[in-house]
Interface confidence: medium
């Protein structure tokens, strides 16, 4: 039989009598920076180097008895969860082990910042093939260790860190609260949020994606065929970095953006019980539990987007919330979400020549978040259109009117503290799929973008009735780019995409009469790349 | 015992090269700032991360640190560098008291500081 | 269909030393490390050593350092086990078997029919 | 070094009877233990491994229990291929050998 964790990242077409995926990652090397561990356990022996690299603070403690099977035992055990021979994801990686952890489990942020440091040295010195840096450790919000973690990432390398135990926010860890690090949650066996005794998996929107991290068979340091079960959030994190192995084995010319998307779009979706998670984080946490792709290759001919949800604004009147996209995303659209209803909108700008998603809040607002539709979308140029506020009743409105540029997104934007109180909301002409139609006091923008072959549709859904929630999904073969709701609706939440569904949230239904303003109507553009879709069939 | 005696060392070489006050002020406007861990059980007060602007070179952040540890001498601090960071950050790792975070934010090149703080097993 | 086929059995002369083989099918055969077990008649069974066929490693029962000696040829999916300096008390049924991983934790799941050797005079 | 001790070393018994082996280690063994039977003439075959999870293929009225020092095989109605010797098996990690239990036959009364 297989163990429950390696058959929930298993596609059904792997899954036989033995968890024996083809090319177990054998051109990737993982580093690992942890405890000591035991190289020659069977399910790891001949797999591990053991770097000469150790820097790690004194143990707690004058009584402290100092017994190498304990002192092994976290960095052993997620050495054989990521690339153990019986138990392990990626069966084919070698890894290299760095201590940076002593035998307590606790290290320092300037001996991590050292260990990177050599990572990206032996690197420089004798370069390999992809790398794969596993950081199964957690500490306060720390700039300095974000930034080194964002060089090493820049310099192509993946990083793949515990989101942390604390049942907290991951943001206000490091390194899981930096951007360009893959952060991974943990769930159980019921696809539940792992409790760990008081505490449990940190959740949010630092938090990439969710992996198995409970009760998890792997290596034990007490002797060279034991095994353990351990949870957390490292085990967690092994379980993507033997993930991102594979496919980096299968694709090794794979950036970290492309296998950050592939490793959300292969991701079970909406499996994890929100309920667990704090009220205000529900939204922000990504419902998504790690799996391999149903095959290594031919994933190329999909257009892959993911949501980034921004800080929140803070509660003042002026504030501001940015969301960003990767270095090479694009920013496909825009929007916002404020829990009181309290906002002014949303618009895209240029900052340091790229663009960035800014949500603003409104007088009274206890402020807002901005959501970013971030693709990967090659030879891309995008740009944004913006039309001001309108005088005629009509409302405002904008297209893409260059040839060949074609509309992703929509957003509105507007000055004045309560828009569209009391006025009946504005349709959009039918068979304009090119416009955005916003409120006549709101500026409106509009993403437009070219790339080979690409080809968008807009998607409705109104409801009539009050309603707390109205989606709208794309079909099939097209991705969500663009999510936002139908101007004219005063009491509308916000708009955000989850995955590939459109998502626009009104007040509590109760606190609103069933007139015409309770109609809601949710707009998703729906993209795809017929560019992509033809590279990748001239490929087979 | 030889460890010490090397730093020993640089420290009297820094001493006599370095003139007291700042040779290269910070450019206008733009201050350091100076970081440490919300959680104050997992703070390492005492040790240092000196990040510096990051365009600056190897022998800049070297001489950053000797000239950090001459204006702490004359003060009659003693500090060590334990590290230079060269390949992804340009800074430094140094042990010194508190008292000097003032001085070291003035110095040329720096752009923030960060108190050590702990990192723990998931 | 897992299968393990000892041979190399026989009377061999005291002091005398022989080689005996195991050839396994139905498996990756260096996925799995395999043993060595003796069982002397009417005795219990006794472990010789092991091998790891995936990088030749080996490890031995102290009591037979020196006197076994465990290889493999991964190209025929074969083990092997050289015993020297062969005495009386060496007389024994000698069985391979293949150490399976069952979610946690090791056993021997399939053995070989096993091969008599007979060290007398 | 680690001692497996099994007990009996014999014992007669009825088709339908309930039968108890143990096993006791030395020192503790967690729950690394295996059972294995053998008739005369043929190989050992796998029963229990991990001191409690029964290997496929064999019958239910087979159940080990049992951690750290202290094990037991039992066959809950004894049938007639079930008459054979049992060795419990676990593996000495300070010295890094296997060690096998003397064994107990299990004889028709």
């Known amino acids: 039989s297989i163990p429950w964790n390696l058959e929930r990242i298993t596609p059904p077409r792997y899954r036989a009598d033995e968890y024996q995926p083809p090319d177990g990652g054998s051109l990737v090397e993982v580093y690992l920076l942890d405890t000591s561990i035991q190289s020659d356990h069977r399910e790891i022996e001949g797999r591990v180097m053991v770097t000469d690299f150790e820097n790690v603070p004194e143990e707690d403690g004058t009584r402290f008895h100092r017994q190498a099977s304990k002192c092994d035992s976290h960095g052993t055990h997620l050495a054989g969860v990521v690339s153990g021979r019986d138990a392990g994801v990626a069966k084919g990686a070698s890894m290299r082990s760095l201590r940076v952890l002593n035998c307590q489990g606790k290290g320092t942020v300037s001996g991590t910042l050292i260990g990177l440091e050599f990572i990206r040295k032996s690197q420089l010195v004798q370069p390999v093939g992809p790398l794969v840096v596993l950081l199964p450790l957690a500490g306060g919000y720390s700039r300095v260790l974000n930034a080194a973690c964002q060089r090493l990432a820049r310099a192509g390398v993946v990083l793949v860190t515990a989101a942390g135990n604390f049942r907290d926010d991951a943001c206000l860890y490091s390194p899981a609260s930096a951007p360009e690090v893959i952060t991974v949650g943990a769930t159980n066996a019921q696809d539940q949020p792992v409790t760990l005794g008081t505490l449990g998996t940190n959740f949010g929107r630092c938090v990439d994606l969710f992996a198995p991290g409970e009760d998890i068979i792997g290596a034990s340091s007490d002797c060279s065929t034991c095994f353990v079960s351990q949870s957390g959030t490292s085990q967690a994190a092994a379980h993507v970095a033997g993930i991102a192995a594979m496919m980096l084995s299968a694709e090794p010319e794979l950036t970290l953006a492309e296998l950050r998307q592939r490793l959300i779009h292969f991701s079970a979706k909406d499996v994890i019980n929100e309920a667990w998670f704090p009220e205000d984080q529900r939204v922000l946490t990504p419902n998504l539990v790690a799996a391999l792709p149903p095959s290594t290759h031919g994933a190329g001919w999909q257009l892959f987007c993911r949501t980034v949800w921004s800080a929140h604004s803070g509660p003042t009147r002026m504030a501001t919330a940015v969301a960003r996209c990767a270095p090479d995303e694009e920013l496909l659209s825009c929007s916002s979400f404020s829990r009181s209803g309290k906002r002014r909108g949303e618009r895209m700008e240029a900052q340091g020549g790229k663009l960035v998603c800014r949500a603003h809040n409104a007088f009274g607002g206890e402020g807002v978040y901005a959501i970013a539709r971030c693709c990967l979308l090659p030879q891309a140029n995008c740009s944004v259109h913006t039309a001001p506020p309108a005088e005629a009743s009509m409302g405002t409105r904008v297209h893409c009117h260059q040839q060949g540029h074609v509309l992703t997104g929509c957003s509105s934007h507007w000055e004045v503290e309560d828009l569209g109180t009391h006025k009946p909301p504005v349709l959009r002409p039918r068979g304009q799929p090119n416009q955005c139609v916003g409120h006549r006091e709101a500026s409106i923008h509009a993403s437009c973008c070219h790339a080979p072959g690409l080809e968008c549709k807009v998607k409705e859904h109104g409801i009539p009735a009050p309603q707390e929630q109205v989606t709208v999904a794309c079909e099939e073969g097209w991705t969500l780019t663009g999510c936002s709701a139908l101007p004219g609706t005063s009491h509308v939440l916000g708009a955000y995409a989850v995955d590939n569904t459109c998502v626009v949230r009104s007040r509590d239904v109760s606190t609103t009469g069933s007139t015409s303003e309770g109609a809601v109507t949710a707009v998703a553009i729906c993209c795809r790349s017929r560019h992509l879709a033809q590279a990748s069939q001239e490929l087979q | 015992q030889e460890d010490e005696d090397g730093d020993y060392e640089e420290l009297v070489l820094a001493l006599r090269s370095e003139e007291d006050g700042l040779a290269e002020a910070p450019e206008h406007g733009t201050t350091a700032t100076f970081h440490r861990c919300a959680k104050d059980p997992w703070r390492l007060p005492g040790t240092y991360v000196v990040v510096l602007k990051e365009e600056t070179h190897l022998s800049q952040s070297e001489r950053t640190a000797r000239r950090l540890q001459a204006q702490a001498a004359r003060r009659g601090y003693l500090t060590k560098i334990l590290h230079v960071f060269h390949g992804l950050l340009p800074g430094f790792l140094v042990k010194m008291s508190g008292d000097l975070l003032e001085l070291a934010l003035k110095l040329p090149h720096v752009d923030y500081i960060e108190e050590d703080s702990s990192v723990f097993a998931q | 269909e897992v299968q393990l086929l000892e041979s190399g059995g026989g009377l061999v002369q005291p002091g005398g030393s022989l080689r005996l083989s195991c050839k396994a099918s139905?498996?990756?055969?260096?996925?799995?490390?395999m043993h060595w077990v003796r069982q002397a008649p009417g005795k219990g069974l006794e472990w010789i050593g092991r091998i790891d066929p995936y990088n030749g490693g080996t490890k031995y029962n102290e009591k037979f350092k020196g006197k076994a000696t465990i290889s493999r040829d991964n190209s025929k999916n074969t083990l092997y086990l050289q015993m020297n300096s062969l005495r009386a008390e060496d007389t024994a049924v000698y069985y391979c078997a293949r150490y399976g991983y069952y979610l946690g934790s090791y056993a021997m799941d399939y053995w070989g029919q096993g091969t008599l050797v007979t060290v007398s005079s | 070094d680690i001692q497996m001790t099994q007990s009996p070393s014999s014992l007669s018994a009825s088709v339908g009877d309930r039968v108890t082996i143990t096993c006791r280690a030395s020192q503790a063994i967690s729950k690394y233990l295996n059972w294995y039977q053998q008739k005369p003439g043929k190989a050992p075959k796998l029963l229990i491994y991990a001191a409690s999870s029964l290997q496929s293929g064999v019958p239910s009225r087979f159940s080990g229990s049992g951690s750290g020092t202290d094990f037991t095989l039992t066959i809950s109605s004894l049938q007639p291929e079930d008459f054979a010797t049992y060795y419990c098996?676990?593996?000495?990690?300070?010295?890094?050998?296997?060690?096998f239990g003397g064994g107990t036959k299990v004889e028709i009364k």
């Open positions: 139905g498996y990756t055969f260096s996925s799995y490390w």
């Open positions: 098996e676990s593996y000495d990690y300070s010295l890094g050998r296997y060690v």
